[in-house]
């Protein structure tokens, strides 16, 4: 028996369902009584889900997994993972045994989009050209780690005097805070872009300083 999985990682958004595809080519006359199917975590060998002795043995992994029982006889051994969490990320191995045995591993890459950045300014009043200001760009609940890029109103990258920090919250999602210290010109726009490298998603925030009032 030959097991086939997708070579590319499966990208799944947090809190959505993901399908880890695995297939085999059943011989003529194949019956499910002959099938032993095991899904396990590749690194730790922890059992995730199994089908043995002609029946679905159920989820051994936080009761969030399911097979496609009607499709098994056609050679579809895919695994459905419900309500994906950050901790589900990793490699999963699909083992299929009929008369002989084969296995293959598929990677699950978890992702979550970053929120639209919120921009804060300190100080936020009595601003004059030549003043040093601190602009903070904050974006929340993304995964995996973000990249943050600052630009001025002409699109020129601002790389000096930038301090970025990232922190994983209780769900493993990241909150990112990036601080730009800049000397004000007569007026100007400062933009922050928070990039999720897996989703190729950019979240934008900007602040325009034109005397008073400020525009966010």
């Amino acid at each position: 028996v030959e097991v086939q999985v997708s070579e590319d990682p499966v990208v799944a958004l947090v809190d959505t369902d993901a399908t880890l595809r695995c297939s085999f080519s059943p011989e003529p006359g194949f019956s499910l009584a002959q099938l032993n199917l095991i899904w396990q975590l590749t690194d730790t060998k922890q059992l995730v889900h199994s089908f043995t002795e002609g029946r679905d043995q159920g989820s051994a992994y936080s009761n969030r997994t399911a097979l496609f029982p009607d499709l098994l006889v056609q050679g579809n051994a895919s695994l459905r993972l419900q309500r994906v969490r950050v901790t589900d990320e990793g490699s999963y191995t699909c083992f299929v045994s009929i008369q002989d045995f084969d296995s293959a591993a598929v990677s699950l890459q978890v992702a979550a989009p970053y929120s639209k950045p919120s921009m804060t300014l300190e100080p936020n009043k009595d601003l004059r050209p030549g003043n040093m200001v601190t602009i903070t760009c904050s974006s929340y609940q993304g995964y995996p780690e973000a990249e943050v890029f600052w630009k001025d109103g002409q699109g020129v990258p601002l790389t000096g005097n930038v301090t970025t920090s990232q922190m994983a919250n209780e769900r493993g999602l990241f909150d990112v805070h990036s601080v730009l210290r800049v000397v004000l010109g007569a007026n100007g726009t400062y933009s922050c872009l928070v990039r999720n490298p897996v989703l190729q998603q950019d979240a934008h925030g900007s602040v325009t300083i034109t005397g008073q009032p400020l525009t966010f």
Epitope: E89, Q109, P144, E145, E147, V148, F149, P157, T159, T164, S165, Q166, M167, A168, E170, G172, R195, P197, V198
Partner: antibody, heavy 122, light 108 residues
Framework: EVQLLESGGGLVQPGGSLRLSCAAS????????MSWVRQAPGKGLEWVSG?????????YYADSVKGRFTVSRDNSKNTLYLQMNSLRAEDTAVYYC??????????????WGQGTTVTVSS | EIVLTQSPGTLSLSPGERATLSCRAS??????LAWYQQKPGQAPRLLIY???SRATGIPARFSGSGSGTEFTLTISSLQSEDFAVYYC??????????FGGGTKVEIK
């Protein structure tokens, strides 16, 4: 084979400069965050700097080197750099480059170079 | 900055004995902790990530546990090649990534 190879270490006077390089092979370099970690003689490990995946990506520094060291990467050459200026005696250490365990993440390092020694002394 | 405190500084044990190493964080870091082994003249080697997951190729005698602020690395039965210095490292809140001061496991 996944490999990191540092070079560029040596003896330099206080106030001097050095540029360390770390050549990567055997993996998709442009998908991995990279780090520099150092170890002073007889001391523990100290994180020095890290850089995100993009060309010209985000750079992060320990307070002890901020303003003096600059990390960069050239994804077309699969190479990580550490430009060290205004070197001090306390920068004397073995410098390691490290690759994160998983692409797109900055957490733990499962691939390390052999280290290159930097000695700052007059 | 999150500070990691490792204890004891030195652990003197005989081959075959069980080693228990501790790492305490100055604030909660969930399970965002790694353990490394380092032998003289060599680069560090990743043992454990996510507080309890063994890295590729690491023998089953190494196990990690804990979450929040208290973490433990256990070597169930010390082999001669396990005598080394062990470091913990957090990646919950950065920069900086921070390492503990290390625990030296030496032959008694």
């Amino acid at each position: 084979e996944v490999q990191l190879l540092e070079s560029g270490g040596g003896l330099v006077q206080p106030g001097g400069s050095l540029r360390l390089s770390c050549a990567a092979s055997g993996f998709n370099f442009s998908s991995y965050w990279m780090s520099w970690v150092r170890q002073a003689p007889g001391k523990g490990l100290e994180w020095v700097s890290g850089i995100s995946i993009s060309y010209g990506g985000n750079a992060y520094y320990a307070d002890s080197v901020k303003g003096r060291f600059t990390v960069s990467r050239d994804n077309s050459k699969n190479t990580l750099y550490l430009q060290m200026n205004s070197l001090r005696a306390e920068d004397t250490a073995v410098y390691y480059c490290g690759r994160d365990r998983s692409p797109y993440q900055y957490r733990s390092m499962d691939v390390w170079g052999q280290g290159t020694t930097v000695t700052v002394s007059s | 900055e999150i500070v990691l405190t490792q204890s004891p500084g030195t652990l003197s044990l005989s081959p075959g004995e069980r080693a228990t190493l501790s790492c305490r964080a100055s604030q909660s870091i969930r399970s965002d902790l790694a353990w490394y082994q380092q032998k003289p003249g060599q680069a560090p080697r990743l043992l454990i990530y996510g507080a309890s997951s063994r890295a590729t190729g690491i023998p089953a005698r190494f196990s990690g546990s804990g979450s929040g602020t208290e973490f433990t690395l256990t070597i169930s039965s010390l082999q001669s090649e396990d005598f080394a210095v062990y470091y913990c490292q957090q990646y919950n809140n950065w920069p900086p990534l921070t390492f503990g001061g290390g625990t030296k496991v030496e032959i008694k």
